[in-house]
Interface confidence: low
């Protein structure tokens, strides 16, 4: 009967952590003697190929300095204590400890039997590294030039991490590629870039982050925060002020970041009415007369720069009683 | 100056459902990754669960059906389902400051006690 | 999950420099916290992403790492540093997220 030596194609490792290397010689065969087991390396140099060996009454033995002795163990491989104990090398699975970028190649598991002579199987090392994800926004001022307002970074992964983003806003990435610190490794940073404007402001965008180590991609929310100067409207009139009218109040409504730091009611023609009194962003009327036919304007301030708003007044005679209700804006 | 404030604990006997309340000052709860960690006396802190800025939530292996994290807009709530009196404990909440670095603002936390 | 391992208790005499270990059962790819406790307060971040300090924590504390053990290192013990430190490291892998305390290091400074 025919034995083979089962193996796995290619076995993924963690940088800096323990893999096992699978092998086995099936099926068992009664009188079948294992006179070695090897594992061997067979596109490093020379002095390094031979990575470990296990002899039925000597045990194991780890001739190359790479990985080496302190690295390498098996897992399940016995040798013979006496003449009452048979060695059992069926199971040569090969543990390497620490693992490095070094570590990854072609390692292949060779059984010396008698009768049947030499058989072997050859298995892939793959050394990842599982890479750590941050993400956090950049506080930006508005501009008509693309800014970068969020980074990603994956940082020491290997292969590199897959960095994409999740947004309803208008944006693109730039995304580089360095060294990591650890040797064979890479930090990958995608910039989420965009022309800053209020609108992008206080927006969450999710980060996504890719890599064959995680069981479903990393998802990091990051909030945006842009600073803008104040974006302005004036609501409160109805087009139904009259003259008399004592109820009228105009609100300058704003959205800004930084907070608006002052708050300028005016009107176009210059003349400003006694009986309309500025309180904050609200223009209090306590008689609307004649002087109310105008343009008002809100300006608003805020540490970047100012917004206004205007609001076209017209007064009438007498209250108009249809169209009450509708509002202007 | 920026602060958490928990609210909530008292006295309750096994099996009467608790809520817990963190309020912040100084900055915007809704930016922030916030986590609940408790400390029964004299023991080790014990990572209960974090809810993300964007809402989503996990929770510590030993900690799911047993606790429930939501949010406001302006607070984070620790629901005890249903406390034993091994969850006595001074139950604090804390700001995680961005992904993968730590908590860097914590409450002074608020006393909880399970007793019939 | 992970188990990160602290020694209970360490002495220190005064302005000596002491180093207070944390031990994860596997070796992680995140990053450790540390913590500091005095009684009856609540925990303060003391070092983040393995070796940054925060603003305000003096830099007589430091952190490092070395496989799978972090290190907290307090060069010049003050009376003031007698407190519980804590290490913590984070677990993003897959659709879990967990976030792990050690069990905790009582600091004595003594003389």
């Known amino acids: 009967q025919d034995v083979r030596v089962q193996v796995l194609p290619e076995v993924r490792g963690q940088l800096g952590g323990t893999v096992e290397l699978p092998c086995h010689l099936l099926p068992p065969v009664p009188g079948l003697y294992i006179s070695l087991v090897t594992w061997q390396r067979p596109d490093a140099p020379a002095n390094h190929q031979n990575v470990a060996a296990f002899h039925p009454k000597m045990g194991p033995s780890f001739p190359s300095p790479k990985p080496g002795s302190e690295r390498l163990s098996f897992v399940s491989a016995k040798q013979s204590t006496g003449q009452d104990t048979e060695a059992e090398l069926q199971d040569a699975t090969l543990a390497l400890h620490g693992l490095t970028v070094e570590d990854e190649g072609n390692y292949t598991c060779e059984f010396a039997t008698f009768p049947k002579g030499s058989v072997r199987g050859m298995t892939w090392l793959r050394v990842i590294a599982k890479p750590k994800n941050q993400a956090e926004a950049q506080k930006v001022t508005f501009s008509q030039d693309p800014t970068t307002v969020a980074l990603c970074i994956s940082k020491e992964g290997r292969p590199p991490a897959r960095i994409s983003w999740l947004s309803s806003l208008d944006w693109e990435a730039k995304e580089t590629q360095v060294s990591g610190t650890l040797a064979g490794t890479v930090t990958v940073t995608s910039r989420f870039t965009l022309v800053p404007s209020g609108r992008a402001d206080g927006v969450t965008v999710t980060c996504k982050v890719e890599h064959e180590s995680f069981e479903e991609p990393a998802l990091i929310p990051v909030t945006l925060s842009v600073r803008y100067p104040p974006e302005v409207s004036i609501s409160g009139y109805d087009d139904n002020w009259y003259l008399g009218r004592t109820d009228a109040t105009l609100s300058c409504d704003v959205r800004s970041n930084p907070e608006p730091t002052g708050y300028d009611w005016s009107t176009t023609s210059g003349t400003f009415p006694t009986s309309a009194v500025a309180q904050g962003s609200q223009l209090v009327i306590h008689a609307v007369d004649s002087l109310f036919n105008t343009t008002f304007v809100c300006t608003v301030t805020n540490a970047v720069g100012m917004g206004r708003a205007e609001q076209v007044i017209f007064v009438r005679e007498t209250p108009n009683t249809a169209g009450a209700g509708a509002t202007g804006g | 100056a920026q602060s958490l404030e928990e609210s909530g604990g008292r006295l309750v006997t096994p099996g009467t459902p608790l809520t817990l309340t963190c309020t912040a000052s100084?900055?915007?709860?809704?930016?922030?990754?916030m986590s609940w960690v408790r400390q029964a006396p004299g023991k080790g802190l014990e990572w209960i669960g974090i809810i993300s800025s964007g809402g989503s939530i996990y929770y510590a292996s030993w900690a799911k059906g047993r606790f429930t994290i939501s949010r406001t807009s302006t607070t984070v709530d620790l629901k005890m389902t249903s406390p034993t009196t091994e969850d006595t404990a001074t139950y604090f909440c804390a700001r995680y400051a961005a992904y993968s670095i730590g908590m860097d603002l914590w409450g002074p936390g608020t006393l909880v006690t399970v007793s019939s | 999950q992970f188990v990160l391992t602290q020694p209970a208790s360490v002495q220190v005499n005064l302005g000596q420099m002491v180093s207070l270990t944390c031990t994860a059962d596997t070796l992680s790819r995140s990053y450790a916290s540390w913590y500091q406790q005095k009684p009856g307060q609540a925990p303060v971040l003391l070092i983040y992403r393995d070796t940054s300090r925060p603003s305000g924590v003096p830099d007589r504390f430091s952190g490092s790492t070395s496989g799978n053990t972090a290190t907290l290192t307090i060069s010049g013990a003050q009376a003031g540093d007698e407190a519980d430190y804590y290490c913590?490291?984070?677990?993003?892998?897959?659709?879990?997220?967990?976030?792990?305390f050690g069990g905790g290091t009582q600091l004595t400074v003594t003389g």
């Open positions: 100084g900055f915007t709860l809704s930016s922030y990754h």
């Open positions: 913590a490291t984070d677990d993003n892998s897959g659709s879990s997220y967990q976030y792990v």
